[in-house]
Amino acid sequence: KTLVLGKEGESAELPCESSQKKITVFTWKFSDQRKILGQHGKGVLIRGGSPSQFDRFDSKKGAWEKGSFPLIINKLKMEDSQTYICELENRKEEVELWVFKVTANSDTHLLQGQSLTLTLESPPGSSPSVQCRSPRGKNIQGGKTLSVSQLELQDSGTWTCTVLQNQKKVEFKIDIVVLAFQKASSIVYKKEGEQVEFSFPLAFTVEKLTGSGELWWQAERASSSKSWITFDLKNKEVSVKRVTQDPKLQMGKKLPLHLTLPQALPQYAGSGNLTLALEAKTGKLHQEVNLVVMRATQLQKNLTCEVWGPTSPKLMLSLKLENKEAKVSKREKAVWVLNPEAGMWQCLLSDSGQVLLESNIKVLPTWSTPVQP
């Protein structure tokens, strides 16, 4: 018995070969002897029933001259899994067709962190093994159900599942979209008074995007977090529902989600969490955003530089007179110089690889007042 593997919805070709390598009479039947189609000597394909009943069945007329009389079954269904009989030259050839189907759980659009379940449907009596490969090359294998927990952004794309049965294989391709922001976290460094831009680009594109979102903010100086803004998303159009009076955030009307804080102030420094709930999806997308604010001031004989917000304890805060060695450098959130000499002073926040934030303050001779450029 010859075995042919097929995929639901696609086509399968069941072979039937003549030893003569020339056109001959043949008939394809179901195992219950019902006739499907055949050729009775006139080179004409005769179907065994009404066109509507047998329109999925065909043969390759072009192959007949070479002694090949395949049965083509289009738009395969699971119930097509059975034995088919080819009668020619006083012999019967049995061909077993097994139709398989691989589906993803409920939806192919899944939120980051959710689980993906791939299910194999197979005909009774079959004992296939299945292995699926993610777009980033991760292999999972198992029985009829394969699960991947904690989906990552890199899992977006085409998953390839190979079903193996009796040394024959059939390959399924399933497109999975992981719904997530491009970055899980970001940090913005700003001088006091500067405008702050927060961007929340999505890592996927869909035709219609509808949902609602909110930005919760935990200021470093505040004891509890508060909602800064809530918004709706309708077909990729953004509309603000509610915004706090302080700070008065502005929001872009189009994707990517974009928020503007008119001024970076010490009281705003801290961490935010933007959540986005998408229509018909359980769970939410999250992106963390952090704001670090720097302030350089001169009060009487004291020049001070301070930073607020979630800084790494490795960051160095320095005060230096332009083109000179740092006067003071500390891994702290505030540094100062007493009786600073006149000139342009720089406050620098740096790490091992770069200056992250810089603020300049002009110190005038003692009889003048300071100027902040």
Epitope: S312, P313, K314, S352
Partner: antibody, heavy 122, light 107 residues
Framework: QVQLVESGGGVVQPGRSLRLSCAAS????????MHWVRQAPGKGLEWVAI????????YYADSVKGRFTISRDNSKNTLYLQMNSLRAEDTAVYYC???????????????WGKGTTVTVSS | AIQMTQSPSSLSASVGDRVTITCRAS??????LGWYQLKPGKAPKLLIY???SLQSGVPSSFSGSGSGTDFTLTISSLQPEDFATYYC?????????FGQGTKLEIK
């Protein structure tokens, strides 16, 4: 391609000095913090020291503080480790490695040299 | 200095197995943790940074998780080339400190 090559290792008596070098190529050396990390025979990895991109800030493991000095010459794309008052427990393979700093938030050592061996023995 | 306690110190496993290595910090280090692989005679190799970010070019069978004080490195399906020694490193604050290492051997 991005490469780090250590040199200067050898056999030295306890109490003596040795200077290791690390030649960097294939990247902008002056934009990265640089580390020394060591592995003693049969032991685990031990962080030794870091020097910031501009050479202004240096930090050391307690076990080498006061004896070792990390330095760099950005014009020569070279990192150094001056090791004084060497002890038997300083015997190790010494690796230089570059640190990537992202947004002052994420840090990692992505490029490592193959190492140079220092043996302190009388 | 921040102490890093890594466990187990050694581990025997077979090709295809799923293995987990843990690292505990003596104080909170947010996500300031990396995982490195070391093979005899070779330079250390970065696998995971910032606790859970997979370094470019590293197989997706490696994953990291955790935040604060408790961290995990998971290898979902061991390959022959994965038998090596693994170290966690806290890069949250100076001085940096490595865990004691976990030697992964073939069963």
């Amino acid at each position: 391609q991005v490469q780090l090559v250590e040199s200067g290792g050898g056999v030295v008596q306890p109490g003596r000095s040795l200077r290791l070098s690390c030649a960097a190529s294939g990247f902008t050396f002056s934009s990265y913090g640089m580390h020394w990390v060591r592995q003693a025979p049969g032991k685990g990895l031990e962080w030794v020291a870091i020097i910031w991109y501009d050479g202004n800030n240096k930090y050391y493991a307690d076990s080498v503080k006061g004896r070792f000095t990390i330095s760099r010459d950005n014009s020569k794309n070279t990192l150094y480790l001056q090791m004084n008052s060497l002890r038997a427990e300083d015997t190790a393979v010494y690796y230089c490695t570059r640190e990537v700093a992202l947004e002052g938030y994420y840090y990692y050592m992505d490029v490592w040299g193959k190492g140079t061996t220092v043996t302190v023995s009388s | 200095a921040i102490q890093m306690t890594q466990s187990p110190s050694s581990l025997s496993a077979s090709v295809g197995d799923r293995v987990t290595i843990t690292c505990r910090a003596s104080q909170g280090i947010r996500n300031g943790l990396g995982w490195y692989q070391l093979k005899p005679g070779k330079a250390p190799k970065l696998l995971i940074y910032a606790a859970s970010s997979l370094q470019s070019g590293v197989p997706s069978s490696f994953s990291g998780s955790g935040s604060g004080t408790d961290f995990t490195l998971t290898i979902s399906s061991l390959q022959p080339e994965d038998f090596a020694t693994y170290y966690c490193l806290q890069d949250y604050n100076y001085p940096y400190t490595f865990g004691q290492g976990t030697k992964l051997e073939i069963k």
